[in-house]
């Protein structure tokens, strides 16, 4: 079953997934899709990595992470209910049948209509930490505690600090994350 | 104009090995992943292997896992299809076929295929 | 794996009449990832239908496809004497990908 993650019209979503790079440069190409995941690549495709970088893209969808350093958590910007849905975290590891798929369900809720300064609201329902072996059995999901309050005016450069602040080291140890090699 | 020819099929003893070939023209053959699809006589058709563009992403089906080994030369715009350890479930015509796709956006189908070629397995 | 399940085994129909063709799946398939392909004897399977309902490259208008979820129909609205033949549908939603058994189209 798809792990579910919230976010509010207007606002960016963001959608974790990790690998760890066998060696610092070594990249495994990556899609994002709109979907589930198929048996191969991505359907509907809004961002694609390759071995060097970011090769494909479209407006509203990026990685706000180091790639480079196998984060290639999606930012969708400016959500509309329209973003709700399934969407295709595939890291294409190469080999037979060796690539690890991750489907990841956004849900978009209506923004507030008058929001107080002093509201809080939910950055995310939760972050699970996803466990994958090379094998093929069923992710081992854990939600981690829940996420500090965070009010309207620090939401809106969330994603700008979540590079440089201790919660993307959190996050980065939150989302769903394989190691290679 | 875009093609796709196979060859390499033939009459072989149970245990035995074979190997296939495609050879494509007319279009990218590296932007493509590319699979083989087998149909046993008056059967329907059944898909074996697909092998990703770059070659490095590789899926066989359970029936010939171990067994049959997908491989491409993107320089020489071929596919191939070693089989090893044939079984008379084997014989069948073998198609390859081109798994279609749009640039950012992957459209699922088997847009290209070649005209077959012939495997038996019998002693 | 994704069993699909055609119906009927065998249509038989005349030229001009409209054919429906059903394609059911064991589990839910995204319509992104269920095509439609025409073999007729001898040659190779011919793509029509890829994401459920969009017409491949030189396919006439009077085929079209439908559905979601687990059911899926294959039209050809008018029938031609060419389009007697074996249909397909197929997934691409889970591995392995998977075929249905075939539909065949005969001229009553």
């Known amino acids: 079953s798809e792990v579910e993650y919230r976010a509010e019209v207007g606002q960016n979503a963001y959608l974790p997934c990790f690998y760890t790079p066998a060696a610092p440069g070594n990249l495994v190409p990556v899609c994002w899709g709109k979907g589930a995941c198929p048996v191969f690549e991505c359907g509907n495709v809004v961002l694609r990595t390759d071995e060097r970088d970011v090769n494909y893209w479209t407006s509203r969808y990026w990685l706000n992470g180091d790639f480079r350093k196998g984060d290639v958590s999606l930012t969708i910007e400016n959500v509309t209910l329209a973003d709700s849905g399934i969407y295709c975290c595939r890291i294409q590891i190469p080999g037979i049948m060796n690539d690890e798929k991750f489907n990841l369900k956004l849900v978009i809720k209506p923004a507030k209509v008058t929001p107080a300064p002093t509201r809080q609201r939910d950055f995310t329902a939760a972050f699970p930490r996803m466990l994958t072996t090379r094998g093929h059995g069923p992710a081992e999901t854990q939600t981690l505690g829940s996420l500090p309050d965070i009010n309207l005016t620090q939401i809106s450069t969330l994603a700008n600090e979540l590079r440089d602040s201790r919660l993307a080291n959190d996050l980065r140890d939150s989302g769903a994350t394989i190691r290679i090699g | 104009q875009v093609q796709l020819v196979g060859s390499g099929g033939g009459l072989v003893k149970p245990g035995g090995s074979l190997r296939l070939s495609c050879a494509a023209s007319?279009?990218?053959?590296?932007?493509?992943?590319m699979s083989w699809i087998r149909q046993a006589p008056g059967k329907g058709l059944e898909w074996v292997s697909f092998?990703?563009?770059?070659?490095?992403?590789?899926y066989y089906a359970d029936s010939v896992k171990g067994r049959f080994t997908i491989s491409r030369d993107n320089a020489k715009n071929s596919l191939d299809l070693q089989m090893n350890s044939l079984r008379a479930e084997d014989t069948a015509v073998y198609y390859c076929a081109r798994d279609g796709m749009v640039r950012g956006m992957n459209f699922y189908g088997m847009d290209v295929w070649g005209q077959g070629t012939t495997v038996t397995v019998s002693s | 794996e994704i069993v699909l399940t055609q119906s009927p085994g065998t249509l038989s129909l005349s030229p001009g009449e409209r054919a429906t063709l059903s394609c059911r799946a064991s589990q839910s398939v995204s319509s992104s990832y269920l095509a439609w392909y025409q073999q007729k004897p001898g040659q190779a399977p011919r793509l029509l239908i890829y994401?459920?309902?969009s017409r491949a490259t030189g396919i006439p208008d009077r085929f079209s496809g439908s559905g979601s979820g687990t059911d899926f129909t294959l039209t050809i609205s008018r029938l031609e004497p060419e389009d007697f033949a074996v249909y397909y549908c197929q997934q691409y939603g889970s591995s392995p990908i998977t075929f249905g058994q075939g539909t065949r189209l005969e001229i009553k």
């Open positions: 007319g279009f990218t053959f590296s932007d493509y992943y």
């Open positions: 994401g459920a309902s």
């Open positions: 092998i990703s563009g770059s070659g490095s992403i590789i």
